[in-house]
Interface confidence: low
């Protein structure tokens, strides 16, 4: 066990805190919850601080909870290839480039790492080049998530790891606004990281409302586990 | 200083409900996660449930959940503990512990500030 795994055998509180603009609209956004690494579960309220918020919730999802990457399930024969609970507790910085298909682009930057007993996301996001009346700043987006498949590989050179995948937007007139997310996660510390061999994380998560809850709000539920990666052939044979 | 006063304990039958109630004083309510914590005769102090600061996140201890219910009302700086279905077996000190935190935890030493208890027997 590394010893940052040893931080995430239990429940862990989260806290997500995002300044974001895009084109030009400021806004802030702050989640709390907790996160469950045994299971890869993630339980989320994000509340808009600023309003309304001037993005649809489910181009940000990959910002806030594939943020907390940390969280994900790795089964015993994958733990050595996880880097992201290595990292902790003093963190990592994660970057991404999206790319909107036919619209513009988001660039974030966060550091993820725990603050006393709380794994906290604080990220800056920066949008440019939307269409007013495109997908997103149109709001034309279903309040819903696909599952998909994050693909991981070692990036020897920054001692991290480069991420890479497609996230699928539904769109209310029944097509699909394509999001393409090139992540780089690199260490805080200088103490050593797991760098993993090649392989991903599947994801699923549900998007609902808090009944009670009357500003701009997304309420949270994913699950995350690691796969890609057979037990070695001595396994087999046991 | 903090203060947190507990108030709402009694005798029940099984069965019946309560509500405890816990006053804060003395601070920035609004930036404390709160706990419930209870201690019967002989027993070590247990978690009971807690509520995040900003009233978003609630969790409990397995053999109350669905029974208890942890609300926080910020403009009241009240934490309360609805105590539904009560069994015998529930009968203990009802403790509210503060921590200036996003989130409750189970731990009893992360908490600054406790309440002097409420007596509540089933």
């Known amino acids: 066990m590394s010893k940052g795994e040893e931080l995430f055998t239990g429940v862990v509180p989260i806290l997500v805190e995002l300044d974001g603009d895009v084109n030009g609209h400021k806004f802030s956004v702050s989640g709390e919850g907790e996160g469950d690494a045994t299971y890869g579960k993630l339980t989320l309220k994000f509340i808009c601080t600023t309003g309304k918020l001037p993005v649809p919730w489910p181009t940000l999802v990959t910002t806030f909870s594939y943020g907390v990457q940390c969280f994900s399930r790795y089964p015993d024969h994958m733990k050595q290839h996880d880097f992201f609970k290595s990292a902790m507790p003093e963190g990592y910085v994660q970057e991404r480039t999206i790319f909107f298909k036919d619209d513009g682009n988001y660039k974030t930057r966060a550091e993820v790492k725990f603050e006393g007993d709380t794994l906290v996301n604080r990220i800056e996001l920066k949008g440019i080049d939307f269409k007013e009346d495109g997908n997103i700043l149109g709001h034309k987006l279903e309040y819903n998530y696909n599952s998909h498949n994050v693909y991981i590989m070692a990036d020897k050179q920054k001692n991290g790891i480069k991420v890479n995948f497609k996230i699928r937007h539904n769109i209310e007139d029944g097509s699909v606004q394509l999001a393409d997310h090139y992540q780089q996660n690199t260490p805080i510390g200088d103490g050593p990281v797991l760098l993993p061999d090649n392989h991903y994380l599947s994801t699923q998560s549900a998007l609902s409302k808090d009944p009670n809850e009357k500003r701009d709000h997304m309420v949270l539920l994913e699950f995350v586990t690691a796969a890609g990666i057979t037990h070695g052939m001595d396994e087999l044979y046991k | 200083q903090v203060q947190l006063v507990e108030s709402g304990g009694g005798l029940v039958q099984a069965g019946d409900s309560l509500q405890l109630s816990c006053a804060f004083s003395?601070?920035?309510?609004?930036?404390?996660?709160m706990g419930w914590f209870r201690q019967a005769p002989g027993k070590e102090r247990e978690f009971v449930g807690g509520?995040?600061?900003?009233?978003?996140?609630?969790n409990y201890e397995d053999s109350v959940k669905g029974r208890f219910t942890i609300s926080k009302d910020n403009t009241k700086n009240t934490v309360y503990l609805q105590l539904n279905s009560l069994k015998p077996e529930d009968t203990a000190v009802y403790y509210c512990?503060?921590?200036?935190?996003?989130?409750?935890?189970?731990?009893?030493?992360?908490?600054?500030?406790w309440g002097q208890g409420t007596q509540v027997t089933v």
């Open positions: 512990a503060a921590r200036n935190n996003i989130l409750p935890v189970t731990t009893i030493d992360k908490y600054e500030y």
């Open positions: 003395g601070g920035t309510f609004s930036t404390y996660a």
């Open positions: 509520i995040s600061r900003s009233g978003a996140t609630t």
